[in-house]
Amino acid sequence: TSSASSSSSSAPFLASAASAQPPLPDQCPALCECSEAARTVKCVNRNLTEVPTDLPLYVRNLFLTGNQLAVLPAGAFARRPPLAELAALNLSGSRLDEVRGGAFEHLPSLRQLDLSHNPLAYLSPFAFSGSNASISAPSPLVELILNHIVPPDDKRQNRSFEGMVAAALVAGRALQGLHLLELASNHFLYLPRDVLAQLPSLRYLDLSNNSLVSLTYVSFRNLTHLESLHLEDNALKVLHNGTLAELQGLPHVRVFLDNNPWVCDCHMADMVTWLKQTGVVQGKDRLTCAFPEKMRNRVLLELNSADLDCDPILPPSLQTS
């Protein structure tokens, strides 16, 4: 194999290559701005096609935004000696469409990772766990920001995008220590069933601006530390009793439900009753009906059971087209 002046031998990409001499511990790569005092390196909007090879060992905050990285191979940040201080890595808006397994290996202090605004056609199940073991070493990640990572329709693969993201989140149970997960603006139609069960430490979950229609099969029960749940700007029609009870049972949670197309028919009665007595929902007085037409813009908190009726289902012989 080729080898990297700054790589680990277990990482297929950088294990096989790097600079001729080990980097000076405080040198700043070309096209980057470095502050040793702030432990920060910014290589922003420079059309980089690869992660810089010779990053200073002091780097704690690394900004690689607005580039053209396309692919993050295994060991993309592996260096010898390792970037042991790197705690915050921002790769947003860098035209990534492929993140391979082990891309973030050998970053022992990595707490915050932002991959937002990259059209991820391929996100390896082992992107965050680094290994295909059923139980991997715990990831140090505490905050994972994956807003607007959905690829355009013509780049989406046959498998579901939701499933691909979910597989990366649960692989090896590596993200058990994750406190913050942002998944806004990803066109999610559903939340895969077992994802949240594998993320028991979550305090902040942002699912806003997706296309979630229902939470029927989602369990929030074990998210006992959850403080903020953002479900604004989805396609939610109603929350059913099971979901309402689970949310009510979370001791610290605040739920945000604005801008959903609530259907104010007989199925909404339990939710309206719950809204009137719960302190869980922030801005609950802003929630309004979208359907049926006669109920549009009515405030949910002002409804009573008489308002919430369902049209009787006509027998087929009486239905008209």
């Epitope: 080729s2 297929p12 790097a18 001729a20 070309a30 096209l31 420079r46 059309n47 992660v51």
Partner: antibody, heavy 120, light 111 residues
Framework: EVQLVESGGGVVQPGRSLRLSCAAS????????MHWVRQAPGKGLEWVAY????????YYADTVKGRFTISRDNSKNTLYLQMNSLRAEDTAVYYC?????????????WGQGTTVTVSS | DIVLTQTPLSLSVTPGQPASISCRAS??????????LHWYLQKPGQPPQLLIK???NLESGVPDRFSGSGSGTDFTLKISRVEAEDVGVYYC?????????FGQGTKLEIK
């Protein structure tokens, strides 16, 4: 027309040094990554080294790591390969080649090559 | 390192007849978003020239009698009707990871 012209080859004794150059024209040199690829007499192609467009990334084959250094001067549209501690097995035609990126790229333009002979 | 194995190592083809070269990788060089396998022709006394990028995309200026196919580990370069100017050595090359490697080459001769 894209042109890459290598120079600096020659006959050199083992253990000595040589510096190859590659002069680029006909395209915006500073927008492209560059490689060195070599071909030993009668043999196939071997990738040697890569440098990114802005000199932020450098990669080497194991066979040359620690002995060769790739560099570039975008103001002069020139790519370099500093070869130290030369060995007989470094004898080859050395080509410079252009790419748009390392992994997503390919060698879409090649120079004619310069011959390096390491012999005592 | 990824090893690329080309077959055959040489072939002799009558002008106007088709030709096919195989390249097998020791591990997959495809992802769902890109195929990291390219083909080159090195004519006698010349540097290599790019024929096919990303397994199947014809480089500008290359005659359309050349075509490429494949994904994962198995790839094929085809020439629908060989012409005299097609003689030389054909190489496949991957860009999946460092080091980039080439196949050992396939020498095409005209009968």
């Amino acid at each position: 027309e894209v042109q890459l012209v290598e120079s600096g080859g020659g006959v050199v004794q083992p253990g000595r040094s040589l510096r190859l150059s590659c002069a680029a024209s006909g395209f915006t040199f500073s927008n492209f990554g560059m490689h060195w690829v070599r071909q030993a007499p009668g043999k196939g192609l071997e990738w040697v080294a890569y440098i990114s467009s802005g000199s932020t990334s450098f990669y080497y084959a194991d066979t040359v790591k620690g002995r060769f250094t790739i560099s570039r001067d975008n103001s002069k549209n020139t790519l370099y390969l500093q070869m130290n501690s030369l060995r007989a097995e470094d004898t080859a035609v050395y080509y410079c080649a252009r790419t748009n990126s390392l992994l997503r790229g390919f060698f879409d333009a090649w120079g004619q090559g310069t011959t390096v002979t390491v012999s005592s | 390192d990824i090893v690329l194995t080309q077959t055959p190592l040489s072939l002799s083809v009558t002008p106007g007849q088709p030709a096919s070269i195989s390249c097998r990788a020791s591990q997959s060089v495809s992802s769902s978003s890109y195929t990291y396998l390219h083909w080159y022709l090195q004519k006698p006394g010349q540097p290599p020239q790019l024929l096919i990028k990303s397994a199947s995309n014809l480089e500008s200026g290359v005659p359309d009698r050349f075509s490429g196919s494949g994904s994962g580990t198995d790839f094929t370069l085809k020439i629908s009707r060989v012409e005299a100017e097609d003689v030389g050595v054909y190489y496949c090359q991957h860009s999946w990871e460092i080091p980039l490697t080439f196949g050992q080459g396939t020498k095409l001769e005209i009968k």
